[in-house]
């Protein structure tokens, strides 16, 4: 049969449209299916029928049912029926599956959470948005009329968003809130012959002797999640671990991604107690994916 | 009543056009969507068009996209359906229909039918 | 876009028996399936919508049942005005789509 699913949360407004919709003008007769008691119109009930639109005001656990909503047309009518679930409120943070509206996704350059059923509302701006039960905060999140804009979107962004808001019916408020998953997905990938971001090819840095110094190999491959990309640094054309010098460390390469999407690798060479021979050696950060290699050489001098 | 009333059917040849039009009466023409079907000899209802009511928007077939277009002048109570680059699977008995339930974006059944016009293709 | 299969092609019946028509969708149409009659000759007119709803004028001998992708169209007792051609339309989205049709003819 033509129904759809509903479901609010005790004490809280719940506004359920017929889902057999109609013109503004066709007359709609709302039951309560189980005993086919007819839904009053007055606004005075705490469940009543306006037009296409069955109000809680406020929902109760014991409103749970399916409500028939009849559209008459001058020719037709046609039914439709409205499965309303009223849940207790939950003692925790959690919120449970079944109160979850569909998930949405979102990447860097499409970030909006929209509010789930506030279009049947009479809200005022603004939202509040909450994910993981905590209030966001910060210039990155912006509620903008119905829906929540992330800013320069990432992964750890994913998780669970609550939209808050009041409804008001002939001057009374009744809060509402409804949650639902947000994901990150990469924007598809791809990956391109290597960009060594630092050092300038041919570079000279300049040290003083006895000090520390560290030198950063950064390199960008393309976006997404890259197969092969390694960077690495070379000594006089030589692995780090083939020289045996124990003042001068590699360290393990930095995954790093860029506002702009780009997936890059930053590796840190770490030179101790600067000495006159290290003057005299060719530092080379490679950069390699299945594209190839490319090379920027670097240099030290003394201050 | 209602009563709806097509005409402009005919032969062309491949390649040619024509302009159907359909005459309502009998309903207030401008709240409803309205629709073309045709039916090739021998064969079964197949949906080419609809316009919806006040001012809405256009579907049309995947075979006739880009070559039929669906239009309305409510002031005349008549529908148009305006065919170019006809072929020779284009022949059939044209009517149009009326949708009574009419919302944005959805569709319903047709209860109202004009008798048809016959558009023939062939060289 | 949905298929619509109609069953069978052809039903060879007497008057005063009963006919069942079936009309199977390639997906769920929830019940936005409507069903028409068509005689030689005319347009077709329309007998059940939303599945099982009779539209106004047609006799109660005509039923619809079935939601989903399952629909059947019964007529209780043959008249012999009903041996015409059958057809089914689903409407939950564009494009609407008709089955090929089931003719029903005296045997």
């Known amino acids: 049969k033509f129904s759809k699913q509903s479901w609010g949360l005790e004490n809280e407004a719940l506004i359920v449209r017929c889902p057999r919709q109609g013109k503004s003008s066709y007359i709609v007769d709302w039951y309560y299916s189980q005993t086919n008691k007819s839904i009053p119109t007055q606004e005075r009930n705490r469940v009543f029928a306006s037009g296409q639109l069955l109000k809680f005001l406020p929902a109760e656990v014991a409103d749970s049912g399916i409500y028939t909503c009849i559209v008459r047309s001058p020719t037709f009518n046609r039914t439709g029926y409205a499965n309303v679930t009223i849940y207790k409120k939950q003692p925790d943070c959690n919120v449970p599956d079944y109160l979850m509206y569909s998930t949405v996704s979102g990447s860097e350059k499409n970030s909006k959470i929209y509010c789930p059923t506030i279009d049947l509302y009479n809200w005022t701006a603004p939202l509040e948005w909450f994910k993981n039960c905590q209030a966001l905060q910060g210039s990155r999140y912006k509620a903008h009329k119905s829906f929540l804009v992330i800013d320069n979107v990432m992964t750890d962004d994913a998780g669970d968003y609550t939209c808050k808001f009041i409804h008001n019916e002939n001057g009374a408020n009744y809060s509402v809130t409804a949650t639902r998953s947000f994901t990150v997905k990469d924007e598809q990938g791809f990956s391109l012959f290597p960009v060594i971001r630092a050092p300038a090819h041919n570079e000279t840095k300049e040290v003083e002797i006895g000090e520390n110094t560290n030198l950063t190999c950064s390199a960008c491959f393309g976006k997404g999640a890259q197969f092969l990309a390694t960077v690495q640094w070379q000594l006089n054309g030589n692995k780090i671990t083939d020289f045996s010098e124990p003042r001068i460390q590699q360290e393990e390469g930095q995954n790093q991604s860029f506002s702009n999407g780009l997936a890059c690798v930053n590796t840190v060479l770490r030179i101790a107690d600067v000495k006159e021979e290290d003057l005299l050696l060719r530092y080379d950060c490679l950069a390699l994916n299945l594209h190839g290699l490319r090379r920027h050489t670097i240099r030290l001098s003394r201050k | 009543e209602v009563q709806l009333l097509e005409s402009g059917g005919g032969l062309v040849q491949p390649g040619g056009s024509l302009r159907l039009s359909c005459a309502a009466s009998?309903?207030?023409?401008?709240?409803?969507?309205m629709i073309w079907v045709r039916q090739a000899p021998g064969k079964g209802l197949e949906w080419v068009s609809t316009i919806k009511g006040e001012g809405g928007g256009t579907y049309y077939a995947d075979s006739v996209k880009g070559r039929f277009t669906i239009s309305r002048d409510n002031s005349k109570n008549t529908l148009y359906l305006q065919m170019n680059s006809l072929r020779a699977e284009d022949t059939a008995v044209y009517y149009c229909?009326?949708?009574?339930?009419?919302?944005?974006?959805?569709?319903?059944?047709?209860?109202?039918w004009g008798q048809g016009t016959l558009v023939t293709v062939s060289s | 876009e949905i298929v619509l299969t109609q069953s069978p092609a052809t039903l060879s019946l007497s008057p005063g028996e009963r006919a069942t028509l079936s009309c199977r969708a390639s997906?769920?149409?929830?019940?936005?399936l409507a069903w028409y009659q068509q005689k030689p000759g005319q347009a077709p007119r329309l007998l059940i919508y939303?599945?099982?709803n009779r539209a106004t004028g047609i006799p109660a001998r005509f039923s619809g049942s079935g939601s989903g992708t399952d629909f059947t169209l019964t007529i209780s007792s043959l008249e012999p005005e009903d041996f015409a051609v059958y057809y089914c339309q689903q409407y939950i989205g564009a494009p609407i789509t008709f089955g090929q049709g089931t003719k029903v003819e005296i045997k």
């Open positions: 997906q769920s149409v929830d019940d936005d």
């Open positions: 009998g309903f207030t023409f401008s709240i409803y969507d």
């Open positions: 229909a009326r949708d009574p339930w009419s919302t944005e974006g959805s569709f319903f059944v047709l209860d109202y």
């Open positions: 939303d599945a099982s």
